[in-house]
Structures are given as structure tokens and as C-alpha cells.
Amino acid sequence: QSPIFGPQDVSSIEGNSVSITCYYPDTSVNRHTRKYWCRQGANGYCATLISSNGYLSKEYSGRASLINFPENSTFVINIAHLTQEDTGSYKCGLGTTNRGLFFDVSLEVSQVPEFPNDTHVYTKDIGRTVTIECRFKEGNAHSKKSLCKKRGEACEVVIDSTEYVDPSYKDRAILFMKGTSRDIFYVNISHLIPSDAGLYVCQAGEGPSADKNNADLQVLEPEPELLYKDLRSSVTFECDLGREVANDAKYLCRKNKETCDVIINTLGKRDPAFEGRILLTPRDDNGRFSVLITGLRKEDAGHYQCGAHSSGLPQEGWPVQAWQLFVNEESTIPNSRSVVKGVTGGSVAIVCPYNPKESSSLKYWCHWEADENGRCPVLVGTQALVQEGYEGRLALFDQPGSGAYTVILNQLTTQDSGFYWCLTDGDSRWRTTIELQVAEATKKPDLEVTPQNATAVIGETFTISCHYPCKFYSQEKYWCKWSNDGCHILPSHDEGARQSSVSCDQSSQIVSMTLNPVKKEDEGWYWCGVKEGQVYGETTAIYVAVEERTRGSPHINPTDANARAKDAPEEEAMESSVREDENKANLDPRLFADEREIQNAGDQAQENRASGNAGSAGGQSGSSK
């Protein structure tokens, strides 16, 4: 007996699609070996139609796929646009030849069933409206009109022209005539449900002179669209329910036996399991909307349905669209930390993976906000200016070729806690979600800058020092000047590096930066940080104010600017710390639910790089231009 298992008999009708699942024993060899689907010929030869090696026969071109699910030990053959010629004997199997392990499948494709000549077939989706057309002769123009539904031999009246309506069709069925038409009446049945399907008879008049028409109503549950996504990637459900529900609340739900549990709706409901990784985006005024879910998990696989109803909940007889989501565990997207922890006043360095084949793509970092349908305004990007409230404390470091970029956020406050998304304008699957948890600091920060009141005088020499603990001894220390398009590394001098590597004096580990001579444009935020290769670690920030020699009062109160890193709430950030004429990025968050477009994030801020020569051991640490 074959260890491969599948459906022995598959029957369908012309024009339909079938999905044939074949199960195989769970072994490493089976998971990785070739999977195939072949058609058995009279001569005993089985001709391959499609295989997991990428082969696709001419007769299956554009209408078939074979997808392996190694984690479930199954593979699925999807065949669309069936014709009667597809009827025959097939094998689904494993192995390098079509003689290995296989299972016999019989496929029968029949014609769409025919009804009596006078039967009109109406095919409608659940929740839609059908208009049944009933013709009659002039002699019955003033006679009673009715529509009944066949149940066995009986025909139960649904609606008639005396204003009778069957209770199960109440508020759903209307009988009417159009304009001056004297030979036709219509019955509308709205909010169709599966039990509405069947044979209807419409009648004008009574007895032998009555005019009768047969109507076969087929009510279709939406055939789920199959979506195959990788673990940790993202999926977008594009929902188009039609104009008639444009003004009703929209929802996406996940089928769970008898119910469909709402994941998100436009009335503000959201399943906690999708917190931080879901966005619902209205597309237009015709009721189109999309739902984006990032950071896909194995348990996200299943049947999903979108719909519309004033309650924001699934309701029988309202239009729906359906999907079946498969989550493939053999993912190309690397596993990255989903929770990053920081402390107030400290910093975090978040590594964002992206498709290494798309190193030139634009990188972004956005803050997921829970309000209503969820949104994700961009905070920083490779060509997006840093958003207000994040000046001096947020930067994106691209590391071309590494398949990752790093986002650093410092001067943390508890208000920074929340969900953030890494995304690019390239491969939309590579969207990752990070939850940032900021706790109150219980000890001094690892990096400390002196002097804390940093005011430099134009034309003079100004040095700031960054004290670091011995645990950072072997790491690379750096100073950088923050600007709206990143933090540009400056020459600096590591005092601690002169010591022997055996001992480490906790009090004398210093990396310093000197501005010589100080210029007006040196004013701004400076960061001291540590890193190992391209792996960024802790940072701390300080605002350096620059004043004229002659002036008695400084341009800015540096204590206020730097207090933010210690204990001031985010809202109290200095207003004048960045030029007000800079272009602020203002990306519409809805663009990020769209797989196709991410708009240019605005003019790039003018670069403000400091450069110079690293100083000698004597302490001359370089200058900024």
C-alpha cells in the first residue's frame, strides 16, 4: 500500500478550479525531494504535467501550480479553468522519476448541469441581490403575480402582488414592474443566503391560462482565494465588496467553526493577537479597503473573510470575500527580535532586515498607532526627514549589502513604548514588527557626557568627553553629529585605548571630541556611541549650543535641551533646537498598506558632516569644518 495519501475521486464542473492535496510521510528526504503530478496514459506511461522542480507542461500553462508545505508534509496541486478534456487518471507523487511513491487520483470534469428549456439560471454570491424576470401574456396583465419556491412537489409562495411575503423573505423580497411594461414583472431578493438556492416558479394568472417561468437560483459562497506567505512576512487582503455597502462598517474576520471572529473593523475593534501588526486602509469611496498584517506567525494560517455591515460584525446575507492563508515555515525572512527593551534616558538599536537583493531600496521606520483602523506614520527613512519630536534622538544607519539597516533611538521616555515597523519601498513581504518596551531606569546610564551644560564659543576650542564603562573597552567608540538625514561619524580620540589591555580603570575610559575652532554651524545634537563592526550598541546624546564671544547670554539654555535625556517628558523638547525652515517628512501612513507605492519622503536635509584628522595621543582630537 502506498504511503502517499490524497483524494481518490475528484469531481468538478467545467470552468471550475480544483485544489488537490497529497500527504506524504514526514521524513527529511520526502520534504525536500521532487513532487509531481502526472497523467496516466493508456500505455502505462505517466506524463508529468507539473513538478516542484519548476516544470510546467504546455496544457497546464497559466492555469496550474504545485506548492509544497514541508511543515505539514503535504503538497497542493491547483488546477484552474477545467474542461472535460481534463477528465482522466492522474498520480500525485514523490521522487526523481514518476515511478516512485505515488497515489492514484481520478478526476472527472462534467458539463454545467442543464435545466428544462424554459429555466433561467441565476448565479449570485452570498449577500448580493438577484432580480428574477417573469414574462407573461397580455391576458394576465391584471391577474395576480407571484413567485414561489419548489420544495419537493410543493411550491411555497415567496411573494405575491397582494403584498404577501413569506416571513423568511421579509424585508428582502419585492415584486415590481418597470415603467409601462405590460408583459414582464420582476422580483428582487436581496441579502441572499445559502438556503435561498433552489428552483423558483413565477406565475401570472391562475389555472390553465396562467403564465409560468422557471428560475434556478444558485447562491455561491465565495470560493476562497488561496494566499501562500512565508513565516514573518506580511499579507494584504484586498477587499472589494461593491458600491451598495460603501457606507457600511467594514471588517476582516477569521473563521472559527460556527463563527467568524473579527480581527479588525472600521468601528475600532481589534483582536489583541494582531496588536501592533495590522492596518485597515480605506481605498476609495466605493467601499474598497485593504487589511495588511505583518509579522506572520504559524497560527495566522486559516480562513479569512472580509465583509460589511453597520454593526461591523459578520451578518448572514451580507456580501463577503474569502481567503485561505497558508503560512510556509521555510521562510527566507530571518528571525529577528520581536521585543526590544530599553530604559528611560537610554537608547535602543533596532536591526531591520530587508531583502538583500534590494540594497538600494528606500528604508523606513514607522510608529504603529492603534487609533481606529491602525496607522503607521513614518518617523525616519533613507530619504525622509526625521519627524518632529524625534530630532536629535533618532537616526537610520543603512548598511548596504548586509541585508539589514539599524535604527537608533535615544533619550528614551516611557512614551516611546509601543510597536514600530521596519519597511522598505521594495519587497513588501519584508516588513517586520518590533515592540519597544521602555522601563524606568534604576541606575546611571552606561555612557555619560561631560560637560553636561555644553555651550561652545565661536572661534574657541571646545571639547566634550564621553565616559564609558570597561565592558565597552573592546568596542569601537564614536562621536557623530546628528542631522536630519542621519548621524555622521566625526573624528574622535579614545583616551582609554592608551592603557594596557590587561587593566581597565573604570574612571578613565573616555572618548572625546574637539571642535577647533568652533563655528556657528557646529551647533546641534551630538551622539556618543559604541559599536562592533556594523552592530550598533548604546548611544547617548548632547545638545551643543554655540554662542558669540561678545554675547553675555547663550543662544539657548543647554541645560533644558539636554535635560530631555534625563527626566523631562517628551513634550518638553526644545523648540529651537532645529532650524524651523527644514522640510518635515509627512508621509501618508496609508501608502504603507499599499504594496505598490511609497512616495518620496521629501527633500533631503542638508548634510552637516564634520571632518578632520584624528589627533595625536596628546589629545588634539580633530576639528569640524
Epitope: F5, P7, Q8, D9, V10, S11, S12, I13, N16, S17, V18, S19, I20, T21, Y23, F69, N72, T74, V76, I126, P194, S195, V219, L220, E221, E223, L226, K255, K257, E258, A301, G302, H303, Q324, F326
Partner: nanobody, 129 residues
Framework: EVQLVESGGGLVQAGGSLRLSCAAS????????MGWFRQAPGKEREFVAA??????????YYAESVKGRFAISRDNAKTTAYLQMGSLNPEDTALYYC????????????????????WGQGTLVTVSS
């Protein structure tokens, strides 16, 4: 809530035939799955056959041990499944359970009880030699 009621079981001689029925009430599925499992005394519940339907498609699955002898079908009203059993032998003696569900995930193994949400009480089939 869906109720499943099996009928058609009984005592039959080896080589004989029986037709089991499983009537579902409470809800109709426009797409779904109905299956038959059996449990002989002192043994584990085992898969016999299943029928899955969706959008005009029907898929029939059989256990290797009943292939060619048993046939599963359902009526068009989508409420009853049948198991036509032929060439019965004493090893077929068991309590036969009907199980049903809405269409499960495409890659859940239908031979396991897990995908089936609704179960009947069972009908006894005894095959004497």
C-alpha cells in the same frame, strides 16, 4: 449547533452489504466535509472515508483497507452523507461514527479526527463469519 445522527448499522453476514446514513441538522454547509470513522473494541478510532465539497467540486478520500469496497456519497441538499459498504468481512466490525465540519484548512490531514468539529453518537456494524 449541528447535530449528526447515524443510521443503517446492524448485523450482516461476511460478503454482504450495508448502507450507513448520516443526517445533519441545525445548519447547512455550502462547503464542508463529512467523514466516517470506526472504532473496534479495544482499538483506536480509525479513518474510513471522507467527502469534501466546495463550489461545485467534490473530493472523496478512502482508507487503504476499504478502497474498492466502500463508497462515500452525499445528497444534493447537503445534509446527508452515505457510506455504501460492500464485501464486508469480520474485520469491519466496529462502531461507525459520522463526523463533519466546514471545509478545513487544505493541508490538515483528513484521516485524523482533529479537523472534524461535529460528531455523531455512532452506529454499530457487526459482520459475522
Amino acid at each position: 449547533e449541528v447535530q449528526l445522527v447515524e443510521s443503517g448499522g446492524g448485523l450482516v453476514q461476511a460478503g454482504g452489504s450495508l448502507r450507513l446514513s448520516c443526517a445533519a441538522s441545525g445548519r447547512t454547509f455550502s462547503s464542508g466535509i463529512m467523514g466516517w470513522f470506526r472504532q473496534a473494541p479495544g482499538k483506536e478510532r480509525e479513518f474510513v472515508a471522507a467527502i469534501e465539497w466546495s463550489g461545485g467540486n467534490t473530493y472523496k478520500y478512502y482508507a487503504e483497507s476499504v478502497k474498492g469496497r466502500f463508497a462515500i456519497s452525499r445528497d444534493n441538499a447537503k445534509t446527508t452523507a452515505y457510506l455504501q459498504m460492500g464485501s464486508l468481512n469480520p474485520e469491519d466490525t466496529a462502531l461507525y461514527y459520522c463526523a463533519a465540519d466546514e471545509s478545513p484548512s487544505r493541508y490538515i490531514d483528513l484521516r485524523r479526527p482533529a479537523p472534524y468539529h461535529y460528531w455523531g453518537q455512532g452506529t454499530l456494524v457487526t459482520v459475522s463469519s
